[in-house]
Interface confidence: low
C-alpha cells in the first residue's frame, strides 16, 4: 500500500492507458488528477535563495553554502550537503538547482565568487585622543584583486545600530565600556566574511576634585586639602602661580591635602588642582582653582643708605626701597640718636628725610627702616658728626 | 528644585503600543542618566533600562529588550518610553527616575498602564 | 544576574522600638573602588520609592538619623530605631553593581 500524503506534499495521483502509434511503437497516454496543490518550479521555489561564501585560507578556494531547508540536488552532482565547493575568487560559476519538491525548470544560480577574505582587514582606526568616547572601526584592503568592487558593501552592526559604511566611527561613547561590533562584508549581497570585536572604550578624564578649603598657615606656608573625583584616576597636579611664576607638583593619588612650604610672604597664590589619568593618552581632569594670599613678615632691610650734610646742622638721609615688603603697606621710618638719647623719630612715604637743626660738632647714629603696616623691617645703621660751625 | 513630572495613566488593548513620557525640571536634564522601573500590582520593583539623555546610549535589561524602547528629547527635557505589543503581563506603574552619581535620588510619581481588551 | 533576597518581618512593630531589615545578595556589592553599591528605598502606600540609605551606609539628604545601613560585601542590615507611625511602607533594597540593576523583593513594615 503506498504511503498516505501529508498536505504539504505536492502528490499527483496518475491513471495510466497504453496504445499502438502508427508507427508500431507503443505511446503510453497519462491522465493526471491533482488530489493537492500542484508543486511549485525549482526557479520559483529556489528564486530567493540566499548564499553564503566561506573561505579556505589553506586552498585559498570557497565555498558557497546554499541557504535552503533541505538537500538539493545540483546539475553534473557539483554540490554535496547544499554546498559547493572549490570555487576560484572573483569567478562566476553556475550551478542548477533542483529537489523533489519542485519540478523544472531548475533554478540556475550564478554564484559570483568574491574576493579573498585575507585581502581584507578590520583595523581599528580610534585616535588614541579620542579613544575614551570614540571608536572607529574600518575594513581595509590589503591586497589587490579583479572583482568588482562597486558590488563589495559593508556593513556593522554596534548594539541597535547598523551602518553600511566602509568605515564607521561611533561617538559620544561611555568610557571604560565594551562595545561589541559586529560587521560583514557582501559581495552582491552574499556575505563572505565577517569580524567581531569587543572593543573597550578608554579610560576617560577624571572628574574635578572637589577643594574643601585652601589657605595661608602663615607668612611662608598655605594649605590645601580636597576630595578626590569619583571617576578613575593616577595622580594630581598641583600647580601654584604667583604672579606670572608657575610651579607644578605631581601628587599622590591617595593624598588628599597638600602644606605648601617657602612661599613667599604676602603674595597672593592662584592654586589650580586636577587629577589624570595614563591611558591611551594622559588625561586630564577639570581643574579646581583656589587662591589665597600669604600673611605678613617682616620685610627686608632697606639698601643703599646714604647719610650727607645739606649744611653745618643739617643732614640729607636717602636709601632704596627694601627688596622684599612682605605686607600690605609702606612706610620709611629714621631714627636719629646721639649717644643713646633718641632726637629724632620720623616717618615718611619715600626714604628721603631732611634732617635739620642738629647740635653741631655731634657724632650722630642714624637708623633707617622700612614698615609694611604689620612689621619693621631689619635697620640700617650709619654713623655721621656734623662739624663745627663754619660762622 | 528637582522634578520628574509623569504622563497620565493608559489604558490599552493586547497588541497595541503606549508611550509615555518623564518631563524633567530644576535641574541640567543632560547631566544625569534617565532610569525606568517597573511596578507590577503588590509586587516588587524591576530595573527596565536607562538612557542618556546626552550621548542618546541606551542601555537596557535583556528581558525588556524586545518590549521596550528608550528615547529623550534635549530640548524639551523629556525621556520617553514606548511600550509595544502589549500583553496583560505590561499592566503596571512605570517609574522613571533620575540617577546620581550612587543612587536615583528623585522619582517621577508613576504611570499606570492597563492593558485589557 | 545578582540575586536580591530580602525577608519578611514576621509581626508589625510597636511604635517606639527598634527594628532591623535585612537584605542579602548573591554576589558581593563590594566593587573595586571600595564602595559597596547597596541602596535602600521606602516606598510608602501609594507613594514613588523613596531614597533612604546609599552606598550601603550614607544617609541620603533629609532623611532621619533613626535610619541607619551596614554590612558586608553580601549581607546588609537598614535598622530603624524609635519607630514611627509614618516609618510604615515597603523597604527595598538594590545594587547598582552590575547590569541589570536588581531590587531586592521588598520587606514590609506594619506599627501598631
Known amino acids: 500500500q503506498s504511503p498516505t500524503p501529508s498536505p504539504t506534499d505536492a502528490y499527483l495521483n496518475a491513471s495510466e492507458t497504453t496504445t499502438l502509434s502508427p508507427s508500431g511503437s507503443a505511446v503510453i497516454s497519462t491522465t493526471t488528477i491533482a488530489t493537492t496543490p500542484s508543486k511549485p518550479t525549482c526557479d520559483e521555489k529556489y528564486a530567493n535563495i540566499t548564499v553564503d561564501y566561506l573561505y579556505n585560507k589553506e586552498t585559498k578556494l570557497f565555498t558557497a553554502k546554499l541557504n535552503v531547508n533541505e538537500n538539493v540536488e545540483c546539475g553534473n552532482n557539483t554540490c554535496t550537503n547544499n554546498e559547493v565547493h572549490n570555487l576560484t575568487e572573483c569567478k562566476n560559476a553556475s550551478v542548477s538547482i533542483s529537489h523533489n519538491s519542485c519540478t523544472a525548470p531548475d533554478k540556475t544560480l550564478i554564484l559570483d565568487v568574491p574576493p579573498g577574505v585575507e585581502k581584507f582587514q578590520l583595523h581599528d582606526c580610534t585616535q588614541v585622543e579620542k579613544a575614551d568616547t570614540t571608536i572607529c572601526l574600518k575594513w581595509k584592503n590589503i591586497e589587490t584583486f579583479t572583482c568588482d568592487t562597486q558590488n563589495i558593501t559593508y556593513r556593522f552592526q554596534c548594539g541597535n545600530m547598523i551602518f553600511d559604511n566602509k568605515e564607521i566611527k561611533l561617538e559620544n561613547l561611555e568610557p571604560e565600556h565594551e562595545y561589541k561590533c559586529d560587521s560583514e562584508i557582501l559581495y552582491n549581497n552574499h556575505k563572505f566574511t565577517n569580524a567581531s570585536k569587543i572593543i573597550k572604550t578608554d579610560f576617560g578624564s577624571p572628574g574635578e576634585p572637589q577643594i574643601i578649603f585652601c589657605r595661608s598657615e602663615a607668612a611662608h606656608q598655605g594649605v590645601i586639602t580636597w576630595n578626590p573625583p569619583q571617576r578613575s584616576f593616577h595622580n594630581f597636579t598641583l600647580c601654584y602661580i604667583k604672579e606670572t611664576e608657575k610651579d607644578c607638583l605631581n601628587l599622590d593619588k591617595n593624598l588628599i591635602k597638600y602644606d605648601l612650604q617657602n612661599l613667599k610672604p604676602y603674595t597672593k597664590y592662584v592654586l589650580s588642582l586636577h587629577a589624570y589619568i595614563i591611558a591611551k593618552v594622559q588625561r586630564n581632569g577639570s581643574a579646581a582653582m583656589c587662591h589665597f594670599t600669604t600673611k605678613s613678615a617682616p620685610p627686608s632691610q632697606v639698601w643703599n643708605m646714604t647719610v650727607s650734610m645739606t649744611s653745618d646742622n643739617s643732614m640729607h638721609v636717602k636709601c632704596r626701597p627694601p627688596r622684599d615688603r612682605n605686607g600690605p603697606h609702606e612706610r620709611y621710618h629714621l631714627e636719629v640718636e646721639a649717644g643713646n638719647t633718641l632726637v629724632r623719630n620720623e616717618s615718611h612715604k619715600n626714604c628721603d628725610f631732611r634732617v635739620k637743626d642738629l647740635q653741631y660738632s655731634t657724632d650722630y647714629t642714624f637708623k633707617a627702616y622700612f614698615h609694611n603696616g604689620d612689621y619693621p623691617g631689619e635697620p640700617f645703621i650709619l654713623h655721621h658728626s656734623t662739624s663745627y660751625n663754619s660762622k | 528644585g528637582v522634578q520628574l513630572q509623569e504622563s497620565g495613566a493608559e489604558l490599552a488593548r493586547p497588541g497595541a503600543s503606549v508611550k509615555m513620557s518623564c518631563k524633567a525640571s530644576?535641574?541640567?536634564?543632560?547631566?544625569?542618566?534617565m532610569q525606568w522601573v517597573k511596578q507590577r500590582p503588590g509586587q516588587g520593583l524591576e530595573w527596565i533600562g536607562y538612557i542618556n539623555p546626552s550621548s542618546g546610549y541606551i542601555k537596557y535589561n535583556q528581558k525588556f529588550k524586545d518590549k521596550v524602547t528608550l528615547t529623550a528629547d534635549k530640548s524639551s527635557t523629556t525621556a520617553y518610553m514606548q511600550l509595544s505589543r502589549l500583553t496583560s503581563e505590561d499592566s503596571a506603574v512605570y517609574y522613571c527616575?533620575?540617577?546620581?552619581?550612587?543612587?536615583?535620588?528623585?522619582w517621577g510619581q508613576g504611570t499606570s498602564v492597563t492593558v485589557s481588551s | 544576574d545578582i540575586v536580591i533576597t530580602q525577608d519578611e518581618l514576621s509581626n508589625p512593630v510597636t511604635s517606639g522600638e527598634s527594628v532591623s531589615i535585612s537584605c542579602r545578595s548573591s554576589?558581593?556589592?563590594?566593587?573595586?573602588?571600595?564602595?559597596?553599591?547597596l541602596n535602600w528605598f521606602l516606598q510608602r502606600p501609594g507613594q514613588s520609592p523613596q531614597l533612604l540609605i546609599y552606598l550601603m551606609s550614607t544617609r541620603a539628604s533629609g532623611v532621619s538619623d533613626r535610619f541607619s545601613g551596614s554590612g558586608s560585601g553580601t549581607d546588609f542590615t537598614l535598622e530603624i530605631s524609635r519607630v514611627k507611625a509614618e516609618d510604615v511602607g515597603v523597604y527595598y533594597c538594590?545594587?547598582?553593581?552590575?547590569?541589570?540593576?536588581?531590587f531586592g523583593g521588598g520587606t514590609k513594615l506594619e506599627v501598631k
Open positions: 554576589k558581593s556589592l563590594l566593587y573595586k573602588d571600595g564602595k559597596t553599591y
Open positions: 530644576g535641574y541640567t536634564f543632560t547631566s544625569y542618566t
Open positions: 527616575a533620575r540617577r546620581g552619581s550612587y543612587f536615583f535620588d528623585f
Open positions: 538594590q545594587q547598582l553593581v552590575e547590569y541589570p540593576f536588581t
